[in-house]
Amino acid sequence: EPHSLRYNLTVLSWDGSVQSGFLAEVHLDGQPFLRYDRQKCRAKPQGQWAEDVLGNKTWDRETRDLTGNGKDLRMTLAHIKDQKEGLHSLQEIRVCEIHEDNSTRSSQHFYYDGELFLSQNLETEEWTVPQSSRAQTLAMNVRNFLKEDAMKTKTHYHAMHADCLQELRRYLESSVVLRRTVPPMVNVTRSEASEGNITVTCRASSFYPRNIILTWRQDGVSLSHDTQQWGDVLPDGNGTYQTWVATRICRGEEQRFTCYMEHSGNHSTHPVPS
């Protein structure tokens, strides 16, 4: 899994008038990391994990960056023509990634009223617009504004890409939290299914980093992919992750099945409770 930093900003307009303020969230490696606290005009760490990542760093740089981005997005929304009456939103999602081989990816996506209308690869500066005529019109509107704005030059997009990666590297280098290993807690449960069958579920929780192998085995051999159901690997809000895998087996054959878990070079097997 690559390390990633994801900015999600939203600005609103009412009856064609852009509202002051903005909403902003930042995710680090898929975990809620910071959000902009409008009441206190600052980027606020999301929980103890985020505080630990920041260490004794303040939120000044993050606050300034989010404030600047929010201001830019408000200006962009102001340049979207023919805004109808009522409430409208413009959302910008910017993501940068550092992969295991040190390669990088950066992209930026714009949504109007929740509909994607413009994407950009920040490395190649290549723009993509969905086929719908609404998206085409919105994209032309926004791109024209971005071209007019002297700041939105090639240099600007290169800087957006570089800044995002620089921030991500800063967190990765300075934080012990992001270099730690937390082994999963594994729990196997069973529940009645159809006649003669039971569903066995293996849950792994509170682990870090995100990479994990979780699979059911019968007589020591992994079951085929299509006989198992997997849950997504999701953040649990504490800077760690959780996931699950389930399969259906014949009652009475429980002792033949084990849940196999592999994480950060360690592995373990877990039987079905009787």
Epitope: K40, C41, K57, T58, D60, R61, T63, T67
Partner: antibody, heavy 118, light 107 residues
Framework: QVQLQQPGAELVRPGTSVNLSCKAS????????MNWVKQRPGQGLEWIGM????????RLNQKFKDKATLTVDKSSSTAYMQLSSPTSEDSAVYYC???????????WGQGTSVTVSS | DILLTQSPAILSVSPGERVSFSCRAS??????IHWYQQRTNGSPRLLIK???ESISGIPSRFSGSGSGTDFTLNINSVESEDIADYYC?????????FGSGTKLEVK
Amino acid sequence: QVQLQQPGAELVRPGTSVNLSCKASGYSFTRYWMNWVKQRPGQGLEWIGMIHPSDSETRLNQKFKDKATLTVDKSSSTAYMQLSSPTSEDSAVYYCGYGNFFYVMDYWGQGTSVTVSS
Amino acid sequence: DILLTQSPAILSVSPGERVSFSCRASQSIGTSIHWYQQRTNGSPRLLIKFASESISGIPSRFSGSGSGTDFTLNINSVESEDIADYYCQQSNFWPFTFGSGTKLEVK
């Protein structure tokens, strides 16, 4: 216009506590962090801590954790700093200051000169 | 805590001269440095934020530069009203810290 009013001077007996005030006007008091800064005679500036009047969230310099307590009274738009068990080391000018963001102080009070003496 | 070292302790210049104040941080703080002026018996006044961002109402002769550990405040043509102490402050790490200050004297 923005004003942060502080009493000019306070004379304090050693060992007793003193509550310094900073009355804000001309801006929305509950929106911005209020900082407190110490300056000993002929010396530089030292950050004590800050408080957000909306919910009294406080960030304190660890050096002052047993010395300073920050509070606010929203009804009078006043910030307070209580200094406990003052000694001669606490004789200084104490400034309150705020900015649109927590990291800079755009506006400062005139400072309160605290003299600890028996 | 981040140590900010300001040098020299005293600067003496003639009116109209350009003057530079130095502030060095004990570790990298990006551009999280802010500059204040304090005249005798007065309160500090914000001059520059984030190393180089100007503040409304502050004369354009004041400017700032630097990033990482080395920062500079410049006055491009000193006036007699600039006689004061100048302090840098960092906001990148808790607790906020100030430099020891540089006193500007005008000959």
